[in-house]
Interface confidence: medium
C-alpha cells in the first residue's frame, strides 16, 4: 500500500507541502527560544531544555516522544579552585596569570552558569617550565620539530594554536612527543578575518575570546567508562585509569591577548618558515624556554578540574511509518552547547525543530511517511558525542537491521556564503537532484537553483558542472551510525569562502560570544541560510522516508571506490623499490573494485526494470540497496580502533575531522620509511590491501542478482 | 527527594515478607531503587536494585528469596522476600540508586520475624 | 569484594583529628568508593562519594582519600555532632558490600 494512498496526493506535492511549511521566522524564534541561558551537558538546564523540546515535539504531533537516559563521564571545573596558566619568576612568584574567564557579552552580564574556558577532560596537575611553540600541533609540526630542527618537547609544556586538526589530536600528539603540559590558544591569523570588527561590532573573536571543548581520543568509543556498551544503570564501568581516550597531561585552552604575553617572550630557536607565523606582534619563537631577560621565569599550568559519572538526556521522537514502519530513517543533532549554543548546536536544533514540526503538520492532515522517521536531540556531543553513541549501543541491533539513513543537524551556519555537504556516495545523486528543485538563497542567484550557486562557488575538482561534495570524517553524531555501523550518513550546512577566509572554522566558536545576536545581526539577519538549510536537510529526510525506491545510487560509489584505490596506489608508488622488494600488489584491489562496477552497473538497470508493484521485490530490492553500506563494515574494525569498523572511510588518524579514504592502508603507509621493521611493516600493507580487496568484493556480491 | 517504606512489621516465620517504597521529588523512569537491611545492632547488608528500565539484580545468597517489582505511575517500589527466618528480622531501608551509590534513604521499616 | 573497616569502635575528642580506614580485599576504583554517616536510630546518609567529594550539607572538616584498597575517611577537627558510624561502601561489579562500619563516639 503506498504511503500516498490515504490522502490521495501525489508524492511530488508531499514534499512540496512539507517545504512549504518551512519558515524562516520559525526557525528564527525557536532559534532565540534555545540560546537565552547556557545549556552544558549534565546541568538542570539542558535536561529542562529537553522536556521542553519533548513536549513540543508531542504538540507538533509526533506519534512518540521519550526521554533516553545514561549516566556517562564528564568534565568540569573546579568552581572554587579556578583554572589558569601563570608566569613565574625565579622565585615561584607569579607574575602573570591567565584570565580566569571571558567578559561576558552585553546583556549577558548577569546570566549564571556561564562555565569558565577549559579542557574538558583534562587530569589535574600544575606542571611548570619551559615552553615550545608547537603551530598547530599537528603531526607534520611535531615531525618538523623533532627531525629537522631536533628539538625536544620532553619534559616541556608545549603551546600550539587551535584550527587545522581537532584539538584531541594535538593533544594526542604533544604527548606522545613527552610534553607534560599543553596550552591552546586561538591566533587572530586563524580565527580574526581582515576588515571585520570583533564581537560585539561583528562576527570576529575578541583578544578576551576562548575556544572550549573536549580533548579526547575515543576513536568512536563513546562513554569513556563504558566503550562498546551503553552506560546504563547496571552498565559494568572501567575505573578511571582504565577509561578510553583520556589526556594524561594538563591542558588549558586561553585567548590571544593571554597569548600574546606567553609568546612575545619565547626563545630559542626561530620559527622554521613562515607557515609558523601567525598575526600577533611576537617573532613565534619555537623555544624552549623565554629569551634572555626572561631565561629564568617559568610557565606553570594550575588545572584542577574533575571527571564526574552524570546523567545525560537525548530526546527521542518517532513519526510511525505507514507502509515500512521497520526502517528507519533518522534526523539527529546535539542540543548541548559549552555556553549559549548561537552556533553550535542551536542554529541546527533549531531547524530540527521546524522539520518536526512541518513534519507534524502534514501527519494531523492525514498525511504519513512510508517508513519510520526518528528525531533526536542529543546531548553530550560537546563531550565526545556520548548521547548519540550511547543510545547507538543500546539500539544497535535494530540500527543494523533496520537503519536506512542517518542525516546530521548540528550546526545550521559556519558562514553564509555557500552549501556544504559531506555525505555516503550513495546519496550524491539524491543531493544533486534535491538541490536542483531548491531556490538559492544567495545575492546575485535569484530565481537561479540551490544547485547552481553551490556549484559555481564550490565546484568538485573531478567533474565539471557540478559542485564538490566532501567524504564524512568525525567530529559530529553522524560518527556512530556510519563509521561504527554503517548506516548511510549525510550532513548540509551553510559555509563560508574557504578561498577567501582561511580561517579555522568560525571565529566565535565554542566561545561565550556564540550568541543569537551574532547570528541575527551579523550571519543571517533574514534566517534565509538557515531556511535554504532546513530544505536540505528536512528534503532529504523526507525523500529517504518517502520514496517508493531508496534514493541511493550505487553506481556513485563505484566511481569514488576506483578513485580512492587510484589515490592509496600513488601513495604507495612513493616506495617503489620497496614495493618490488615486499611483492606488494595492488591488483586484487583495482580487481575488486572492477567487479563492484560491474555489478552495481547491472544492479541499476535492474533498479529501472523491477515491477515495483510487487512488494516482495521491491523490498528485496530496497534492501540491497539499505545494506550496500553495511557491507563495508569489517566487524573487526581498523587496527587499535576497533569503534571504526568502515573499510572505506574513516576518522584521519591526524585529524578527527577529516575524512580519509582507505584508512587501513594509509595508515599502514604513513611515515613507513621510518618503521623499524620495514617487512613486518610492509606486511601490514599487504594485509590492509587484502582486507580493502576483499570487503569491496563482499559489497559488490551483495548488489548481485539474488538468485 | 523523599523515600517511604511501609510494611508489616511482625512476620511468622516461613511466611512471606512484602514491603512498599513510595517515592516522590523523582521518577521512577529515571533512577533505579536499591533495597538494603540492617539487623538490629548490625551493618548494613545491600539486598537488590531494580532500575529505571525495569532490569533487577538481587545480592547471590537471597537470590532465590527476593523479588522486586515496580509500579512507575503509582511510584512505588515492592520488595517480596519468602520464607522468613528470625535471622531475616532487620530494618529494611529503600534508597535511590545512583551510579553505584545510594543517595537518598528512606526511613526504614522494622521487620520482626517471630511466632 | 570484601570491605574492612578499622577501629571498630574508637573514641575522640571534640577538636581532635579523626581518621578511619576501609580496606578491600581486592582493588577497587576510587570513583566507586564511598561513604555514609548513620545516627543511632536513622537511616544512613551519603556522606563522601567517589573517594573524595563531599555530599550535599557535609561540612568542610571531613574529607577522604585513598586509591586501590586502602581508603580512609578524616574529620580535621572533630565536633560533637560527628559522633556516628561511618560505612564504606564499594562497587566492582555487582553485588554493591558494606564494610562492618566504624563506630565513632565522643570522650
Known amino acids: 500500500k503506498s504511503s500516498n494512498e490515504a490522502t490521495n496526493i501525489t508524492p511530488k506535492h508531499n514534499m512540496k507541502a512539507f517545504l512549504d511549511e518551512l519558515k524562516a521566522e520559525n526557525i528564527k524564534k525557536f532559534l532565540y527560544n534555545f540560546t537565552q541561558i547556557p545549556h552544558l551537558a549534565g546541568t538542570e538546564q539542558n535536561f529542562q531544555l529537553a522536556k521542553q523540546i519533548q513536549s513540543q515535539w508531542k504538540e507538533f504531533g509526533l506519534d512518540s516522544v521519550e526521554l533516553a537516559h545514561y549516566d556517562v563521564l564528564l568534565s568540569y571545573p573546579n568552581k572554587t579552585h579556578p583554572n589558569y596558566i601563570s608566569i613565574i619568576n625565579e622565585d615561584g612568584n607569579e607574575i602573570f596569570n591567565t584570565s580566569l574567564f571571558e567578559p561576558p557579552p552585553p546583556g549577558y552580564e548577569n546570566v549564571s552558569d556561564i562555565v569558565p574556558p577549559f579542557s574538558a577532560f583534562s587530569p589535574q596537575g600544575m606542571p611548570e617550565g619551559d615552553l615550545v611553540y608547537v603551530n598547530y600541533a599537528r603531526t607534520e609540526d611535531f615531525f618538523k620539530l623533532e627531525r629537522d630542527m631536533k628539538i625536544n618537547c620532553s619534559g616541556k609544556i608545549v603551546i600550539a594554536r587551535y584550527g587545522k586538526v581537532f584539538r584531541g589530536n594535538k593533544v594526542k600528539n604533544a604527548q606522545l612527543a613527552g610534553a607534560k603540559g599543553v596550552i591552546l590558544y586561538s591566533d587572530p591569523a586563524d580565527y580574526f578575518a581582515p576588515g571585520v570588527k570583533s564581537y560585539p561590532d561583528g562576527w570576529n573573536l575578541p583578544g578576551g575570546g576562548v575556544q572550549r571543548g573536549n580533548i579526547l581520543n575515543l576513536n568512536g568509543a563513546g562513554d569513556p567508562l563504558t566503550p562498546g556498551y551503553p552506560a546504563n544503570e547496571y552498565a559494568y564501568r572501567r575505573g578511571i585509569a582504565e577509561a578510553v581516550g583520556l589526556p594524561s597531561i594538563p591542558v588549558h585552552p586561553i585567548g590571544y591577548y593571554d597569548a600574546q604575553k606567553l609568546l612575545e617572550k619565547m626563545g630559542g630557536s626561530a620559527p622554521p618558515d613562515s607557515s609558523w607565523r601567525g598575526s600577533l606582534k611576537v617573532p613565534y619563537n619555537v623555544g624552549p624556554g623565554f629569551t634572555g631577560n626572561f631565561s629564568t621565569q617559568k610557565v606553570k599550568m594550575h588545572i584542577h578540574s574533575t571527571n564526574e559519572v552524570t546523567r545525560i538526556y537525548n530526546v527521542i521522537g518517532t513519526l510511525r511509518g505507514a507502509v515500512e514502519p521497520d526502517r528507519y530513517v533518522i534526523l539527529g543533532g546535539h542540543r548541548d552547547s559549552w555556553v549559549f549554543g548561537g552556533i553550535d548546536p542551536q542554529s541546527g536544533a533549531a531547524v530540527v525543530h521546524e522539520i518536526v514540526r512541518s513534519f507534524g503538520t502534514l501527519k494531523k492532515e492525514g498525511w504519513r511517511p512510508r517508513r519510520t522517521i526518528l528525531f533526536a536531540s542529543w546531548d553530550a556531543e560537546e563531550f565526545g558525542l556520548l548521547g548519540s553513541t550511547e543510545w547507538a549501543e543500546e539500539n544497535s541491533r535494530l540500527l543494523q537491521e533496520r537503519g536506512v539513513a542517518y542525516i546530521n543537524a548540528d550546526s545550521s551556519i559556519e558562514g553564509n556564503y555557500t552549501l556544504r555537504v559531506d555525505c555516503t556516495p550513495l546519496m550524491y545523486s539524491l543531493v544533486h537532484n534535491l538541490t536542483k528543485e531548491l531556490k538559492s538563497p544567495d545575492e546575485g542567484f535569484e530565481g537561479k537553483s540551490l544547485y547552481e550557486s553551490w556549484t559555481k562557488k564550490s565546484p568538485s575538482p573531478e567533474f565539471s558542472g557540478m559542485p564538490r561534495i566532501s567524504k564524512l570524517g568525525s567530529g559530529n553524531d553522524f560518527e556512530v551510525f556510519f563509521q561504527r555501523l554503517g548506516i548511510a550518513s549525510g550532513r548540509a550546512r551553510y559555509t563560508k569562502n574557504w578561498e577567501t577566509n582561511k580561517f579555522s572554522g568560525y571565529p566565535l566558536y565554542h566561545s561565550v560570544y556564540e550568541t543569537y545576536e551574532l547570528v541575527e545581526k551579523f550571519y543571517d539577519p533574514m534566517f534565509k541560510y538557515h531556511l535554504t538549510v532546513a530544505q536540505v536537510r528536512g528534503g532529504m529526510v523526507f525523500e529517504l522516508a518517502n520514496s517508493i525506491v531508496l534514493p541511493f545510487d550505487c553506481r556513485d560509489y563505484a566511481v569514488v571506490l576506483r578513485k580512492y584505490a587510484d589515490k592509496i596506489y600513488s601513495i604507495s608508488m612513493k616506495h617503489p623499490q620497496e614495493m618490488k622488494t615486499y611483492s606488494v600488489s595492488f591488483d586484487s584491489l583495482f580487481s575488486a573494485v572492477k567487479n563492484f562496477t560491474e555489478i552495481a552497473s547491472k544492479f541499476s538497470e535492474r533498479l529501472q526494470d523491477f515491477d515495483k508493484s510487487n512488494p516482495i521485490v521491491l523490498r528485496m530490492m530496497n534492501d540491497q540497496l539499505m545494506f550496500l553500506e553495511r557491507a563495508f563494515i569489517d566487524p573487526l574494525g581498523l587496527p587499535d580502533r576497533p569503534f571504526y569498523r568502515h573499510v572505506i572511510y574513516a576518522p584521519s588518524s591526524h585529524n578527527k575531522y577529516a575524512g580519509e579514504s582507505f584508512p587501513g592502508i594509509y595508515d599502514a603507509l604513513f611515515d613507513i620509511e621510518s618503521k623499524v621493521d620495514p617487512s613486518k611493516a610492509w606486511g601490514e600493507v599487504k594485509r590492509q590491501i587484502y582486507v580493502a580487496a576483499f570487503t569491496v568484493q563482499a559489497a559488490a556480491e551483495t548488489l548481485s542478482e539474488v538468485a | 527527594v523523599k523515600l517511604q517504606e511501609s510494611g508489616p512489621g511482625l512476620v511468622a516465620p516461613s511466611q512471606s515478607l512484602s514491603i512498599t517504597c513510595t517515592v516522590s521529588?523523582?521518577?521512577?523512569?529515571?533512577?533505579?531503587v536499591s533495597w538494603i537491611r540492617q539487623p538490629p545492632g548490625k551493618g548494613l547488608e545491600w539486598l537488590g536494585v531494580?532500575?529505571?528500565?525495569?532490569?533487577?539484580y538481587y545480592n547471590s545468597p537471597l537470590k532465590s528469596r527476593l523479588s522486586i517489582n515496580k509500579d512507575n505511575s503509582k511510584s512505588q517500589v515492592f520488595l517480596k522476600m519468602n520464607s522468613l527466618q528470625t535471622d531475616d528480622s532487620a530494618m529494611y531501608y529503600c534508597?535511590?540508586?545512583?551510579?553505584?551509590?545510594?543517595?537518598?534513604w528512606g526511613q526504614g521499616t522494622s521487620v520482626t520475624v517471630s511466632s | 569484594t570484601v570491605l574492612t573497616q578499622s577501629p571498630a569502635i574508637m573514641s575522640a575528642s571534640p577538636g581532635e583529628k579523626v581518621t578511619m580506614t576501609c580496606r578491600a580485599s581486592?582493588?577497587?576504583?576510587?570513583?566507586?568508593l564511598h561513604w555514609y554517616q548513620q545516627k543511632s536510630s536513622a537511616s544512613p546518609k551519603l556522606w563522601i562519594y567517589?573517594?573524595?567529594n563531599l555530599a550535599s550539607g557535609v561540612p568542610a572538616r571531613f574529607s577522604g582519600s585513598g586509591s586501590g584498597t586502602s581508603y580512609s575517611l578524616t574529620i580535621s577537627s572533630l565536633e560533637a555532632e560527628d559522633a556516628a558510624t561511618y560505612y564504606c561502601?564499594?562497587?566492582?561489579?555487582?553485588?554493591?558490600?558494606f564494610g562492618a562500619g566504624t563506630k565513632l563516639e565522643l570522650k
Open positions: 521529588g523523582f521518577s521512577l523512569t529515571d533512577y533505579g
Open positions: 561502601q564499594q562497587y566492582s561489579g555487582y553485588p554493591l558490600t
Open positions: 531494580i532500575w529505571s528500565d525495569g532490569n533487577t
Open positions: 534508597a535511590r540508586h545512583k551510579v553505584y551509590t545510594m543517595d537518598y
Open positions: 567517589r573517594t573524595s
Open positions: 581486592s582493588s577497587v576504583s576510587s570513583s566507586y
